[in-house]
Interface confidence: low
């Protein structure tokens, strides 16, 4: 019995280890800087990396510009979006700003495409100073459903900083829908 | 053989427990007051509370100004900087500021120190008003190795906020590497 | 024995189930614009949506508009606050603003109330602008015990923007207390 | 607090043409999906159709598709259902609904299409 | 012919717990899709009940409750009483990219 209860024990302590390691799915996508686009519009911003540097995926997909869930659960979603001005880049088209970031929600099963957070200031950048900069972070706790996709929209997009550390985000599942 | 199976159910029960309560790690971190350094250049801050208040840490190690990782993982990295200058304080050295955090990691076995956030706003004080106040809030999802170190670096620290519910930083560790 | 093998896997499978969904507390809020206070001076808001759109709370309580612990724990918490103001809302009282939040912790045991997290910034929203717009996010990992009260406090109410997607807050536990 | 107002319904011969507004006003009318949803008098309810935020996604019951057609105006707040081809199985009252998150969260108090010879 | 089928009718005295259901197909409930409920009393528009299966939004008492389990969703509708007397319908998505409705229950109080 003691061989029983021995491989009870082994069977178990694999299982444990792999519920424990059983990859919560979880992106930490950075900005994709050759592919930024132009302009001072509220934009959807598609060209990210999964794959370099601190950008990491895991049982989620990238694909198309939208960080697309494959486990339902509750997540944490958070983004980082910097916008940066130096004055060796020519003038800005207005010294009155709204730099804005939106992170959405998007199913195509269920027809549905909803803001789950947004934030962001509006800003006087004037040309008394050389250099501008401004960061935005948001974060929440959302249900989130096999299929669904998060995908990110800024203003005025050719402002962004395209370093992985000042434009990014991601998402971690934390727990399973009861 | 009922006897074993509570045997093994006991020993599961508590492996269960322990398991879940297996000290996931954690630190949250607060500006320790009495020792920030003045002027207004880019420096490391190195006195940080981890033991009194809201600071707290488990299975990581505080050492030296720097947040050492001592178990492989995913972990949530987090920090909220706030700044802020009162009239009674002096006259600024100038009025146009930029009011910066970068979290950034440092590996010994690997001599290599690299950001992984940064945020803030370049920021006009100007002599009108009595008090300015400014908070940034990074947060992202990285992959850290024992041994490696977590460090904050700042810009214009004389201007810091001392208070423990305004200037910190942590991490907790959600999920191991697989 | 194999019987009694499989009917112990058995209960552990459960067991381990039982355990990974066993329901960790968490809780998004989110603004309740019908009843937002007027005013420019600090205040608890205490309306706040926790059934419907992106709002929901599991394994927590939400009371006269406080969020209430129900299981000791250690806890990540968040709030994103939106204050904006448009031309035809008519003039501000002051073009010179400090948009605050407070995040703050209350033990009814022990009777205490405390500032776990707070951020903002005095902005300068001047009437050359016909909008203006500012967000604060600050978030934070925590020891909080059952019974305790979470609470928000904001300056200059009024200007709080109202979407769900703007002014919210939230938990969720981590792990647990050793 | 939410308001939803149809108008727009009436009598109307089999073959002919009827558009449905729907007026919205408390919520923000341009980031919420629309639906529209039909009672046939004394049965149940039946979805007709559904118009994404900024309208790249629409979708139909197969009852209803290829003739009736879906649309919104988020400068004026407003949801339309423009009917075509309508047959007498069409008659029944037609509700706006506000989708919130997966829900039809709130309703109108509907408008009465007849369609009758 | 609904796509989701419900019981025609129910009935229970006042006080007294009442289960309706909703049972679909593995297109729709199956699917993983979230069941939604409606009351509709009479002469009124409908109003949601329950959504994502089991949450109840701000207003509705909690004697009602939702829950789901592969194809099939139930309402349940306990302490019974006067006013709980309306037609109840259950809702989701289905792969087809279509609302579907259940042909409704009417909950008689007796």
């Known amino acids: 019995i003691r061989a029983e209860k021995a491989m009870v024990d082994g069977s178990w302590l694999d299982l444990a280890k792999r519920s424990k390691l059983e990859a919560q799915p979880f992106a930490h996508l950075t900005i994709n800087a050759t592919d930024i686009p132009s302009g001072s519009h509220k934009v959807s911003l598609s060209s990210w990396y999964h794959d370099r540097g601190w950008a990491k995926i895991s049982n989620m997909t990238f694909s198309n510009g939208k960080l697309i869930v494959n486990q339902d659960g509750f997540y944490y979603l958070y983004a980082n979006i910097c916008f940066r001005h130096h004055e060796t880049s020519g003038d800005l088209a207005t010294e009155y700003l709204q730099l804005m970031v939106y992170v959405t929600k998007t199913s195509i099963k269920i027809p549905s495409s909803h803001t789950l957070m947004k934030g962001g200031s509006t800003k006087y950048w004037s040309g008394n100073s050389e250099f501008h900069f401004y960061s935005i972070n948001v974060g929440g706790f959302f249900k989130l459903r096999s299929g669904e996709e998060i995908s990110i929209e800024v203003s005025n997009p050719s402002l962004l900083d395209p370093d992985q550390d000042a434009t990014y985000f991601g998402a971690f599942k934390v727990r399973d829908i009861d | 053989i009922r006897a074993e199976k509570a045997m093994v159910d006991g020993s599961w029960l508590d492996l269960a427990k322990r398991s879940k309560l297996e000290a996931q790690p954690f630190a949250h971190l607060t500006i320790n007051a009495t020792d920030i350094p003045s002027g207004s250049h880019k420096v490391s801050l190195s006195s940080w509370y981890h033991d009194r208040g809201w600071a707290k840490i488990s299975n990581m190690t505080f050492s030296n100004g720097k947040l050492i990782v001592n178990q492989d993982g995913f972990y949530y990295l987090y920090a909220n900087i706030c700044f802020r200058h009162h009239e009674t304080s002096g006259d600024l050295a100038t009025e146009y500021l930029q009011l910066m955090v970068y979290v950034t990691k440092t590996s010994i076995k690997i001599p290599s120190s690299h950001t992984l956030m940064k945020g803030g706003s370049t920021k006009y004080w100007s002599g009108n008003s009595e008090f300015h106040f400014y908070s940034i809030n990074v947060g992202g999802f990285f992959k850290l190795r024992s041994g490696e170190e977590i460090s904050i670096e700042v810009s214009n620290p004389s201007l810091l906020d001392p208070d423990q519910d305004a200037t910190y930083f942590g991490a907790f560790k959600v999920r191991d590497i697989d | 024995i194999r019987a009694e093998k499989a009917m112990v896997d058995g209960s552990w499978l459960d067991l381990a189930k039982r355990s990974k969904l066993e329901a960790q507390p968490f809780a998004h809020l989110t603004i309740n614009a019908t009843d937002i206070p007027s005013g420019s001076h600090k205040v608890s808001l205490s309306s706040w949506y926790h059934d419907r759109g992106w709002a929901k709370i599991s394994n927590m309580t939400f009371s006269n508009g406080k969020l209430i612990v129900n299981q000791d724990g250690f806890y990540y918490l968040y709030a994103n606050i939106c204050f904006r103001h448009h031309e035809t809302s008519g003039d501000l009282a002051t073009e010179y603003l400090q948009l605050m939040v407070y995040v703050t912790k209350t033990s009814i045991k022990i009777p205490s109330s405390h500032t776990l997290m707070k951020g903002g910034s005095t902005k300068y929203w001047s009437g050359n602008s016909e909008f203006h717009f500012y967000s604060i996010n600050v978030g934070g990992f925590f020891k909080l015990r059952s019974g305790e009260e979470i609470s928000i406090e904001v300056s200059n109410p009024s200007l709080l923007d109202p979407d769900q997607d703007a002014t919210y807050f939230g938990a969720f536990k981590v792990r647990d207390i050793d | 607090e939410v308001q939803l107002l149809e108008s727009g319904g009436g009598l109307v011969q089999p073959g002919g043409s009827l558009r449905l507004s729907c007026a919205a006003s408390?919520?923000?009318?341009?980031?919420?999906?629309m639906n529209w949803v039909r009672q046939a008098p004394g049965k149940g309810l039946e979805w007709v159709s559904s118009?994404?935020?900024?309208?790249?996604?629409?979708y139909y019951a197969d009852s209803v598709k290829g003739r009736f057609t879906i649309s919104r105006d988020n400068s004026k707040n407003t949801l339309y259902l423009q009917m075509n081809s309508l047959r007498a199985e069409d008659t029944a009252v037609y509700y706006c609904?506000?989708?919130?998150?997966?829900?039809?969260?709130?309703w109108g108090q509907g408008t009465l299409v007849t369609v009758s010879s | 012919q609904s796509v989701l089928t419900q019981p025609p009718s129910a009935s229970g005295t006042p006080g007294q717990r009442v289960t309706i259901s909703c049972t679909g197909s593995?297109?729709?409930?199956?699917?993983?899709?979230?069941v939604h409920w409606y009351q509709q009393l009479p002469g009124t528009a409908p109003k949601l009940l329950i959504y994502?299966?089991?949450w109840r939004p701000s207003g509705v008492p909690d004697r009602f409750s939702g829950s789901k389990s592969g194809t099939s969703a139930s309402l349940a509708i306990s302490g019974l009483r006067s006013e709980d007397e309306a037609d109840y319908y259950c809702?989701?998505?289905?792969?087809?990219?279509?609302?579907?409705f259940g042909g409704g229950t009417k909950l008689t109080v007796l």
């Open positions: 118009i994404s935020v900024n309208s790249n996604y629409i």
């Open positions: 809702a989701t998505w289905d792969d087809s990219l279509h609302w579907v």
């Open positions: 609904a506000r989708d919130s998150e997966y829900a039809f969260q709130n």
């Open positions: 408390g919520f923000t009318f341009s980031n919420t999906w």
């Open positions: 593995s297109s729709n409930i199956g699917a993983g899709y979230d």
């Open positions: 994502d299966n089991e």
